[in-house]
Amino acid sequence: CDLPQTHSLGNRRALILLAQMGRISHFSCLKDRHDFGFPEEEFDGHQFQKAQAISVLHEMIQQTFNLFSTEDSSAAWEQSLLEKFSTELYQQLNDLEACVIQEVGVEETPLMNEDSILAVRKYFQRITLYLTEKKYSPCAWEVVRAEIMRSLSFSTNLQKRLRRKD
């Protein structure tokens, strides 16, 4: 499956929008930094079949979409930027879903891939727990925004490697 060129443009647009969403001085949030245990090894792209990589990317984008679709997120961010960001993510999900169907077909997803998807889900659970513990404070959201920018960058790099494999 060849992801459309618009997909990588959408990736870049999503990152730009996320960068623009900041509302407070990042410097004031230094003490709130947190290790969410991003599963980097799931995004290095070496041990995966293409179908598995696409499934993990899909899970990453889906969980990001879910995180920024909550009521708490709506209260934290400027509405028009948030809507544009969500739209970009939604388009990426559609592209990836089409690819998942094409690449995997009717085959069962390998167990290794289930572990990878679980690692991504647990990562987002840790992010949600952090936000809850910090009572969804402005700094907590800034830290999460920075973290998601970093994890989306890993996703973008994995997609670039997948395109090079084609």
């Epitope: 900041g22 990042h26 930094r33 830290v143 920075a146 973290e147």
Partner: antibody, heavy 121, light 107 residues
Framework: EVQLVQSGAEVKKPGESLKISCKGS????????IGWVRQMPGKGLEWMGI????????RYSPSFQGQVTISADKSISTAYLQWSSLKASDTAMYYC??????????????WGQGTLVTVSS | DIQMTQSPSSLSASVGDRVTITCRAS??????LNWYQQKPGKAPKLLIK???SLQSGVPSRFSGSGSGTDFTLTISSLQPEDFATYYC?????????FGQGTKVEIK
């Protein structure tokens, strides 16, 4: 490959102005803050201040506040450190280094090669 | 400001020795501490991040420990290329202060 390349050595007279640079490459420049560190001859490291190139927000060490200005031009992936009126005591090696901001990644993992500033009459 | 006090300020050791450098913060900085190595005429090099995590590409003879106010950098078996000055830096609060440095010299 991530690189921070600093401008060359400078020899200036007291009272003169100066702007030194730090150009980032091999990574997304606006995703990392750029910090500046001073090292006077035979002395230790002193943290001067930092800039977020995405919005040019800055934070200075109280020791350097008002003495220097940190700026950035994200269109050319370059951060700057400048003086409006140099003093002999500004003679030092100046380093830039990148910081991942609020993301959980190594702080100051890449450094520039340093710019030696000599101020003498 | 958070003061960072390193000890000793210098030490003499032989190749193969186990070397320990300590760094004390004037208030708790959790695990927000880096250790750097600097050789004459060169930029500092990150060795240890987050107090105990080895930076990529750094030999495993280097290790870091501690949390809160007391931190340690250990070189398990000193090599000829390890003779340098070592600095700790707190990254918890502004300004991001350094320790005064520890020079490791050949005995």
């Amino acid at each position: 490959e991530v690189q921070l390349v600093q401008s060359g050595a400078e020899v200036k007279k007291p009272g003169e102005s100066l702007k030194i640079s730090c150009k980032g490459s091999g990574y997304s420049f606006t995703s990392y803050w750029i910090g500046w560190v001073r090292q006077m001859p035979g002395k230790g490291l002193e943290w001067m201040g930092i800039i977020d190139p995405s919005d040019s927000d800055t934070r200075y060490s109280p020791s350097f506040q008002g003495q220097v200005t940190i700026s950035a031009d994200k269109s050319i992936s370059t951060a700057y450190l400048q003086w409006s009126s140099l003093k002999a005591s500004d003679t030092a090696m100046y380093y830039c280094a990148r910081h991942p901001g609020l993301a959980w990644a190594p702080d100051f993992d890449y450094w520039g090669q340093g710019t030696l500033v000599t101020v003498s009459s | 400001d958070i003061q960072m006090t390193q000890s000793p300020s210098s030490l003499s050791a032989s190749v193969g020795d186990r070397v320990t450098i300590t760094c004390r913060a004037s208030q708790s900085i959790r695990n927000s501490l880096n250790w750097y190595q600097q050789k004459p005429g060169k930029a500092p090099k990150l060795l240890i991040k987050w107090a105990s995590s080895l930076q990529s590409g750094v030999p495993s003879r280097f290790s870091g420990s501690g949390s809160g106010t007391d931190f340690t950098l250990t070189i398990s078996s000193l090599q000829p290329e390890d003779f340098a000055t070592y600095y700790c830096q707190q990254l918890y609060d502004w300004p991001l202060t350094f320790g005064q440095g520890t020079k490791v010299e050949i005995k």
